[in-house]
């Protein structure tokens, strides 16, 4: 669980998510898992003042 060295990147750097299609990167254990196993933030209501969050968990293209 989140063990070993990890390089720190700039805030806008892409998340290094070497996952196969249909898998997502679990940020909390730093591993690729089936996307359905992860719960994402609640969607913003329409017209919310805060922009939609940029996700680091989308499946690899």
């Amino acid at each position: 669980m989140r063990r070993g060295p990890r390089s720190l990147r700039g805030r806008d750097a892409p998340a290094p998510t070497p996952c196969v299609p249909a898998e997502c990167f679990d940020l909390l254990v730093r591993a690729c898992v089936a996307c359905g196993l992860l719960r994402t933030p609640r969607p913003k209501p329409a017209g919310a003042s805060s922009p939609a969050p940029r996700t680091a968990l989308q499946p690899q293209e």
Partner: antibody, heavy 117, light 111 residues
Framework: EVQLQESGPSLVKPSQTLSLTCSVT????????WNWIRKFPGNKLEFMGY???????YYNPSLKSRISITRDTSKNQYYLQLNSVTTEDTATYYC???????????WGQGTTLTVSA | DIVLTQSPVSLAVSLGQRATISCRAS??????????MHWYQQKPGQPPKLLIY???DLESGIPARFSGSGSGTDFTLTINPVETDDVAIYYC?????????FGGGTKLEIK
Amino acid sequence: EVQLQESGPSLVKPSQTLSLTCSVTGDSITRGYWNWIRKFPGNKLEFMGYINYSGTTYYNPSLKSRISITRDTSKNQYYLQLNSVTTEDTATYYCATPHTYGAMDYWGQGTTLTVSA
Amino acid sequence: DIVLTQSPVSLAVSLGQRATISCRASESVDDYGISFMHWYQQKPGQPPKLLIYRASDLESGIPARFSGSGSGTDFTLTINPVETDDVAIYYCQQTSKDPWTFGGGTKLEIK
């Protein structure tokens, strides 16, 4: 909407074992992370540990080998067991679930535990 | 463990004014281009409520009076303007490294 509800004793004697249950509705505990957090009388919050979608557990090292978190997926419940309690374990115990960044957006109402002889 | 130090410990602000709460981490909580820092509000007899996640993202349903900023080791929660309903204790939390930790809390009162 995910809902969590803690249940368990309100009073435990020193050296006994504390057992708490978190009952979850609105989502399956086979996805996501399922945490235990406690708040001490002085307002300090402590993350105790979690069990996740795969059944993997993580425990705060401050609790050493006293803690165990388990689950029953058929009941959609998860459990906290804390052994050898002392008066220092007097606190309000919460179950909570975070989203992908670890931010806990759903919490139970909390159950207050007093450890006293 | 990453230690989160909040300041001030308590804060009294006039209605309609700005409240600023600081959270300093003992080491960076940034990884993968993300700040793993979150803010909660807790009122007596209630569980904590998530306000801000990932340093600056407003949780769904939270008024835009609340905002978060910062990266690395220094983070700020701002409430502007402060309303009566904002009287509470505010906590920062990091989930960058095990074990996840919370700040000691900042108590907000109305002047």
